[in-house]
Each structure stands twice: as structure tokens, then as C-alpha cells.
Amino acid sequence: LKGQEFAPSHQQVYAPLRADGDKPRAHLTVVRQTPTQHLKNQFPALHWEHELGLAFTKNRMNYTNKFLLIPESGDYFVYSQVTFRGMTSECSEIRQAGRPNKPDSITVVITKVTDSYPEPTQLLMGTKSVCEVGSNWFQPIYLGAMFSLQEGDKLMVNVSDISLVDYTKEDKTFFGAFLL
Amino acid sequence: LKGQEFAPSHQQVYAPLRADGDKPRAHLTVVRQTPTQHLKNQFPALHWEHELGLAFTKNRMNYTNKFLLIPESGDYFVYSQVTFRGMTSECSEIRQAGRPNKPDSITVVITKVTDSYPEPTQLLMGTKSVCEVGSNWFQPIYLGAMFSLQEGDKLMVNVSDISLVDYTKEDKTFFGAFLL
Amino acid sequence: LKGQEFAPSHQQVYAPLRADGDKPRAHLTVVRQTPTQHLKNQFPALHWEHELGLAFTKNRMNYTNKFLLIPESGDYFVYSQVTFRGMTSECSEIRQAGRPNKPDSITVVITKVTDSYPEPTQLLMGTKSVCEVGSNWFQPIYLGAMFSLQEGDKLMVNVSDISLVDYTKEDKTFFGAFLL
């Protein structure tokens, strides 16, 4: 009840009081990506730095093989930013010739994989058309939201084109999650 | 252990139970910027409204001289949005003439200053090329992530060009942090 | 005091310890919008999915008639992303003819309604000029920040043009809030 004091005698097993500093948390930062085969019709996943610089994982939140592993069930805030950079796209040349065109685009997806499900679940997507004329371009896509996750769930960040990801600085491209 | 009840006898000194309403928190909103000298090769810092309107600081999180002061060590979620607005950039004229060009850009950086470190640490950066043709333009850059901060750390928001920041409304440009 | 153990005897009534899993939380996802009359000079509000797929409301946070209802006073993190999509705007044609023009724009506002206030309060605004040349375009606007809300407050998401909102996928356009 509102205003009720949650002394131990009031605790429910399913929602114990717990020290905030003990909650699973991770902030991962970008590293240079190694070329890998990715499944057709599936965006490639980024891999991440998990302990150097600003990056960390704590309280049983582990990072392995491009995935953040969810160590306990609960509501998590999950976020990522990917900074993209590129040269003039073909799209702009076609557009200059006056022919409308489905533009080039950049996309970030935060994906959940559950071993018992055959298909990954897309939790968050940021997608943007890019039709730049006559120049280099760069821009970030930011995503963040709360999800109910289960112990054993795995999170990854997929992008439409790994070669466009700016991997030069840990503050430009990152991925994180924390138990609320 | 999962499901363990965190009654007082189980508490660790380094991670005590604590009332959520007692945690350091701040949400700062934009105000008109006063012209100030800033260091060469360093983006100027914004200053903020700390208590009028939607703005607040609480539980020992203080704002002073463009900095948010971190009153206790822990993991914080830090966020900012800066809305930029401008006129057509020169870049667009060069582009119209068909010459590729490094575009004009807008950048936001959330920076951590630690007195014992000589160099500030860039926690988050949002940077975007801007090549607009024949019009006024406006757009936001949003940033947010979790960081392990130490008591005494100071946070600020730096921008590439203060004159492009939209300071007209508290909901367009803001900066905040809260202990998780 | 810093480092103090918040055992029940130290609890204050106004800030009781409480189980995190018991806090009001919601994540709402996009659905196809039904055309509705909206007030002149006020952006239309989106309505949302509250229980299917990734969407949920819990712990007395309820969704009704386009509003999230705040069930208890406190500091909330509130967020939304809206993905917009459109065809070439007139603005681009005018621009191609060489006449500067106030550009078309897309705007998202997270608004608080308090029954005792005559006017809604705009908590967050993301606004972006859109001047695309010769193509379909799409892009997200993301917002998120912390606010002190009162029991009975209502939150909604308003957009500049409902017909431009991408309602096709729950991961592209969403709205959420959780008590910190």
C-alpha cells in the first residue's frame, strides 16, 4: 500500500527489498568491428568493449560474444547510441538527376534473444533515411526504453551496415542496460 | 543470492538499503546564455536553470557555475538534449556548386571533471553534420547513459556553438542526472 | 547520513524503503491511429497499445484514453520515441527553385495534464525541420528525462501531424514512464 513501510516482515518473496548497488548493470562502448559473416536478412550485430575506459559490467550482468546476458528477471532500462558516418550516397546522385528514389538509410535495432524462442524479438528500432548531397555526413541514432526481461535473455545491438559505424570514440557509440 | 531478502542483517556497508526518495537527482533546463570566454580547443559549457519551472536539484545534488556536483559515489543515469537552430550554412552553397565538402556540424558533449585528473573525460557525445539548403533549420541531439561516478565529480554540457542553441523553452534543451 | 544503513528504524514515513518491483511502470507501443478531432492550436495526442506484445502497465500505473495516469507522487523517468515518415515536402520544391522557406517540421511533445491547472505543461519537446529533396524520408525523434510528478497527473504524447507517424512496428514508436 502507498506509504506502507517495507520492513522485512512486509516483504514479499517475489519483490524483496534489495540494495541498489547490487543490481545488474552494464555500459558497453564501441570498438573497431571485425568483419564477420552474418545471416542473410538479418542485420549484423556489433561487438563491444566491456571493461576498459567507461565500460563496465557488474552484479552478474555479463557480456559475451556480442550479447549482454540478463542474470535475473525484472524490468530493465536498455539503451544504445550508434553514430554513423559515410560519404555521399548514390541516392543523392539519383536525386540530383531528378528521379525520386527510396533513400539510403541507417538503422539500429536492440534485439532480445530467448533460447526457448526460435525468433529474436526487436525491442527498439531507430531508422533514418540518409540522402546527403555532395559531402561526408555523420549522425547519431539514440534509443532507450524499459522492458520486462527474463533471466537468460540475451541482448544485442544490430545495425544496417557495420562499415558506417563510427568506432573511433567510446562516447559516440555505446550500449547499456540496468535493472530498475 | 537471487530471491534473498535484504533484511538489515544481510546489508553490506558498501551497498546499504536506502530510500529512493533520498537519492541525488537533478533536472536542469535551458536559460539564455551569457557570452563568456572559453578555452581554445574546448567547446563552451552551457549554464542552466536549476529551480524555476521544471528544473530542480535535490538530495545534495547541487548546481554551481555550469557544473552538476556529484555528492556521493555510485552509478548515475546522465542525460541531456540540446536543440540547435540556425540559418543555411555555407556548406550548402559549396555543395550546390557540386564540390564535396566537410559539412558544418553540431555537437553536444557531456563532460566529467575530476579535480584529481588534469583532463576532463567525455562521457557522451552526439555529433551531426548539418548541410541544409536554402532555409532555417532546427533539430535536437539527445544523449543518455549510465556511468559510475565518484563523490566530487562535476558534470557539464559542452556544445560546438552556443549561438546555435535554442534557449527559448525549458522542454527543448535540458540536462539531468540521477543516482540509480 | 552517507553510508548510513537504512534499517526500518531509520525509515521516514515520507520516504519509506520499498520493493523496486512494486513501483508504477509502463511501456506503451504504437498502434494505428484513428482520426479524431483535436483542439485548434494543440497538437493531436497519440493513443497506444498497453498490454499486447512489448507493452505493459503495472503497479497501479494505468493507461486510459491516450493518457498515462500517475498513481503516486514522486520522481519519474518519462520517455518516448516517435518515428515519422513522409513523402517529399513542398518545402523542398520551393528550395529547389532557390527561394528560402520556413521548412516543414516534425514535432513530438510529452505533455502533463493536471486537473487543477487550466493549461497543460509541456515536459519535453523534440522538434526538427524536414526539407527532403526528391524522395520518401523517415526518421525518429527520441525524448527522455526525469520529472517530479504528482498523484493524479496525466501524461500524453502529442505530435505535429498524426498522419506522418509510423505505426507499423512496436519498436519504432513508443512511450513509457517509471517511478525512480
Epitope: - | V31, R32, T34, K169 | T121
Partner: antibody
Framework: QVQLQESGPGLVKPSETLSLTCTVS????????WSWIRQPPGKGLEWIGY???????KYNPSLKSRVTISIDTSKNQFSLKLSSVTAADTAVYYC????????????WGQGTLVTVSS | DIQMTQSPSSLSASVGDRVTITCRAS??????LNWYQQRPGKAPKLLIY???SLQSGVPSRFSGSGSGTDFTLTISSLQPGDFATYYC?????????FGQGTKLEIK
């Protein structure tokens, strides 16, 4: 140039409600904080409260139970109501603008004297 | 509430004099301190904001200094129009509070 002008009755009876309006000209009422401040004859300045264009208000705790400040953005006006007045509420009432905490009250009305007397 | 205490409460000086008025806050207000001049029958006028920033249009003989709890307004060379009452005001928190005023009179 921004100008503020207070208007309202100069005489109010005890126990009644004092009502004043401030009209802002030469600029928009949006994006600023609009305060009422009063000064009893021969005494110092007392802040009553502010309103933001969105309707967000904050009042001096010493007066909070009796004060209501409202705003009409379409008319570029904001108003003060002070209920249950006594002779101690006799003062010159000023409206003033604050851009933000950093900047102080940069524009003031000329003030209007309100006397509480039967 | 934050209490603001000005000293002196009154001051006599002559044209051309250098005058200093002090203001003390009951707790730290960083640099959120403003100074106003009020002539008889007129509204206050902002002179200095943020402890030391000169408001546009105010003569440069007015200056402010200080931070935390102790602040000073200095008039470097008094002019005839400067004889008035001066108030300090904190804008660090609400309620906004003013000092009791310093009346500057001609000697």
C-alpha cells in the same frame, strides 16, 4: 522594449479578495517567469510568487494559502488574487519578469498602491 | 527561507565618493545574488545580476563581487542620481528574498 503595467482597484475592504492584472507589451509572455512582488509603505520588498507561461506556479510559503496567480497567454497578461486581506496587505504591488534564476528581475511594472481599508 | 542581511542600513556620502554596501546570505547561494536601485516612488531597477554581471544600460561605476554567502556592491564614484535605496536579492531558491535595504543619502 518590454513594458509591464499593473491594473486593478486601489482600495479593497478587509476580508475581501485583492485582484490585480499585469499586462505585458513589447514582447511575448512565453518563456519567462512572471512574479508579483509587494512593498508595504516605507518598508522592504516581499516576493509573493511566480507563474510560468505553462501555468506552473510557485508561491511564498508565508502567503501560499491566500494566493493564486494565473496567466492568459492569449492576452499577454497574468493576474494575482490575494484572499482574506487585512490592513497588513496594504502595499505597492509590482509585477516583474525573471528570465531565469541567474538573471534577476530585469523588467518591472511601475507598481500600483493597494490600500486595505473599510 | 534564505535570509538576506544588508549593511549598513543607511549611509551618508558625497558626490565623487567610493561607496560599498555589503550583503550576507544565511546560507551559500553561490553567485545567485542581484542588486537593485530604487528611487523614491519608482520601481526597483536591476543593476547587477549573478553577483558581478552588469545589467545592460547600467553605468560601469557600479560593480558587484562575492560568492557563497558574502557579497558587495561598489559605486566607484557617486553621481547625484545614485542617491537612492539599494536592495540585494537572492535568486538561488524560492521564495525569493530581499535584503532590508540600504538608504544612500547625501552628506
Amino acid at each position: 522594449q518590454v513594458q509591464l503595467q499593473e491594473s486593478g482597484p486601489g482600495l479593497v475592504k478587509p476580508s475581501e479578495t485583492l485582484s490585480l492584472t499585469c499586462t505585458v507589451s513589447g514582447g511575448s509572455i512565453s518563456s519567462y517567469f512572471w512574479s508579483w512582488i509587494r512593498q508595504p509603505p516605507g518598508k522592504g520588498l516581499e516576493w509573493i510568487g511566480y507563474i510560468y507561461y505553462s501555468g506552473n506556479t510557485k508561491y511564498n510559503p508565508s502567503l501560499k494559502s491566500r494566493v493564486t496567480i494565473s496567466i492568459d497567454t492569449s492576452k499577454n497578461q497574468f493576474s494575482l488574487k490575494l484572499s482574506s486581506v487585512t490592513a497588513a496587505d496594504t502595499a505597492v504591488y509590482y509585477c516583474a519578469r525573471e528570465t531565469g534564476s541567474y538573471y534577476g528581475f530585469d523588467y518591472w511594472g511601475q507598481g500600483t498602491l493597494v490600500t486595505v481599508s473599510s | 527561507d534564505i535570509q538576506m542581511t544588508q549593511s549598513p542600513s543607511s549611509l551618508s556620502a558625497s558626490v565623487g565618493d567610493r561607496v560599498t554596501i555589503t550583503c550576507r546570505a544565511s546560507q551559500s547561494i553561490n553567485n545567485y545574488l542581484n542588486w537593485y536601485q530604487q528611487r523614491p516612488g519608482k520601481a526597483p531597477k536591476l543593476l547587477i545580476y549573478a553577483a558581478s554581471s552588469l545589467q545592460s544600460g547600467v553605468p560601469s561605476r557600479f560593480s558587484g563581487s562575492g560568492s557563497g554567502t558574502d557579497f558587495t556592491l561598489t559605486i566607484s564614484s557617486l553621481q547625484p542620481g545614485d542617491f537612492a535605496t539599494y536592495y540585494c536579492q537572492q535568486s538561488y531558491s524560492t521564495p525569493r528574498t530581499f535584503g532590508q535595504g540600504t538608504k544612500l543619502e547625501i552628506k
